[in-house]
């Protein structure tokens, strides 16, 4: 039978999405117990039938990976969780409408920082996603977001930073003092979707100038 309030058993049903990995998460309510079991269904916008997610039926953990099931970038999705307590009480709650393009957050980029004597080179590696193209190969963030660019900053001292940015993958900050430590931060920006990744940070030291020794 239904509880007085579904929130007694189940709360905060939502998608948590990062780089298009879409995880459904939820919390148990105040009357939830360790032996409460959860079953997950999902569907697309305007469809009547909910689809049971294999591997996420009568589970006791509070998350379910729906990345594969929600992989169409232009589709809107919902998921819902039904909680059943040991005593047979049940509650169902659904997510808000979910668009991975709109809702996914961006992880920091993968960057290699290379020290030179008077410069620091930064090489940004393409970020793979679970999204697959028609031919089966995995798309990168750059494939998905055509206006994606990188913003790079080098902290020279407390009052001075150098900035670079663009769509290319290789950057170099020139005119640096040898044998000096710098802090680099690199972010991914996607203006059309108002997205900004958390920064990748690298603390690097320029090489000593051996030409005078």
């Amino acid at each position: 039978h239904a509880p007085e309030d579904p929130s007694d058993l189940l709360q905060h049903v939502k998608f948590q999405s990062s780089n298009f990995e879409n995880i459904l998460t939820w919390d148990s309510g105040p009357e939830g117990t360790p032996d409460t079991v959860y079953s997950i269904e999902y569907k697309t916008y305007g469809e009547r039938d909910w689809v049971a997610k294999k591997g996420c039926q009568r589970i006791t953990r509070k998350s379910c990976n729906l990345t594969v099931e929600t992989g169409n970038l232009t589709e809107l999705y919902y998921a819902r969780v039904t909680a059943v307590s040991a005593g047979g009480r049940s509650a169902t709650k659904m997510t808000d409408r979910f668009s991975s393009l709109q809702h996914t957050t961006l992880k920091p980029p993968d960057v290699t920082c290379i020290s030179k004597v008077r410069s620091i080179q930064m090489i940004v590696h393409p970020t793979p996603t679970p999204i697959r193209a028609g031919d089966g190969h995995r798309l990168t963030l750059e494939d998905i977001f055509h206006d994606l660019f990188y913003h790079l900053e080098l902290q020279v001292n407390r009052t001075y930073q150098m900035h670079l940015g663009g769509k290319q993958r290789e950057y170099e900050f020139f005119g640096l003092t040898p044998d000096t430590e710098f802090l680099g931060t690199i972010m991914i920006c996607v203006p059309t979707w108002a997205k900004e990744s958390a920064p990748y940070m690298c603390r690097v030291k320029t090489l000593p100038d051996r030409t005078w020794t």
């Epitope: 049903v13 916008y45 305007g46 009547r48 232009t74 819902r80 169902t92």
Partner: antibody
Framework: EVQLQQSGPELVRPGTSVKISCKAS????????MNWVKQSPEESLEWIGE????????TYNQKFEAKATLTVDQSSNTAYLQLTSLTSEDSAVYYC?????????WGQGTTVTVSS | DIVMTQSPSSLAVSVGEKVTMSCKSS????????????LAWYQQKPGQSPKLLIY???SRESGVPDRFTGSGSGTDFTLTISSVKTEDLAVYYC?????????FGSGTKLEIK
């Protein structure tokens, strides 16, 4: 069997507020979206907005943003539409209707008459 | 907002006749994800609530007689009643759910001669 049972007719004064209820039976209110629709002779059917009863997230038709407030009480399986600062233009039949895109189940309607 | 225009506003037919009514949208309702059109049709009999007949432009709701058929794509849609019965006396509305705010047509009133 899914049913949406709405509260009875309301005769209210201009400038006041009214709160209409829609009690769901035959399913859990939190298992689907709930919409509200206004029907008046002048404007036919107008979508007021929707609420996700699980989260309380609402989307309003801009036309009704300052007029309508959608809420739910999960424990009683009931959705509510509150209308404020009522004028004669708000006199209409108001329906609750289930689902996220088109509407598969409708309440029987609540007639609101604004008159001094 | 997407404007939905229905025509005719009313029509009178005899029992057994075929009826078609039109609904045009001010922009395409084709949903790229599933290549379906975000259009529904409702029937509202006198003194009753609207009842869902058709969704996705051509999918018939469970329990709706097969004399009701929805067709069309993009911006032009049609509801056809193949052989009208007296109980079909009603106003018929189309609704788009392609984008917010969802909008309805002004209705076609079907009268029986």
């Amino acid at each position: 069997e899914v049913q949406l049972q709405q509260s009875g007719p309301e005769l209210v004064r201009p400038g006041t507020s009214v709160k209409i209820s829609c009690k769901a039976s035959g399913y859990s209110l939190t298992a689907d979206y709930m919409n509200w629709v206004k029907q008046s002779p002048e404007e036919s059917l107008e979508w007021i907005g929707e609420i996700n009863p699980s989260t309380g997230t609402t989307t309003y038709n801009q036309k009704f943003e300052a007029k309508a407030t959608l809420t739910v009480d999960q424990s009683s399986n009931t959705a509510y539409l509150q209308l404020t600062s009522l004028t004669s233009e708000d006199s209409a039949v108001y329906y609750c209707a289930r689902f996220d895109a088109y509407f598969d189940y409708w309440g029987q309607g609540t007639t609101v008459t604004v008159s001094s | 907002d997407i404007v939905m225009t229905q025509s005719p506003s009313s029509l009178a037919v005899s029992v057994g006749e075929k009826v078609t009514m039109s609904c045009k949208s001010s922009q395409s309702l084709l949903y790229s994800s599933n290549q379906k059109n975000c259009l529904a049709w409702y029937q509202q009999k006198p003194g009753q609530s609207p009842k869902l007949l058709i969704y996705w432009a051509s999918s018939r709701e469970s329990g709706v007689p097969d004399r009701f058929t929805g067709s069309g794509s993009g911006t032009d849609f049609t509801l056809t009643i193949s052989s009208v019965k007296t109980e079909d006396l009603a106003v018929y509305y189309c609704q788009q759910y392609f984008s917010y705010p969802f909008t309805f047509g002004s209705g076609t009133k079907l009268e029986i001669k």
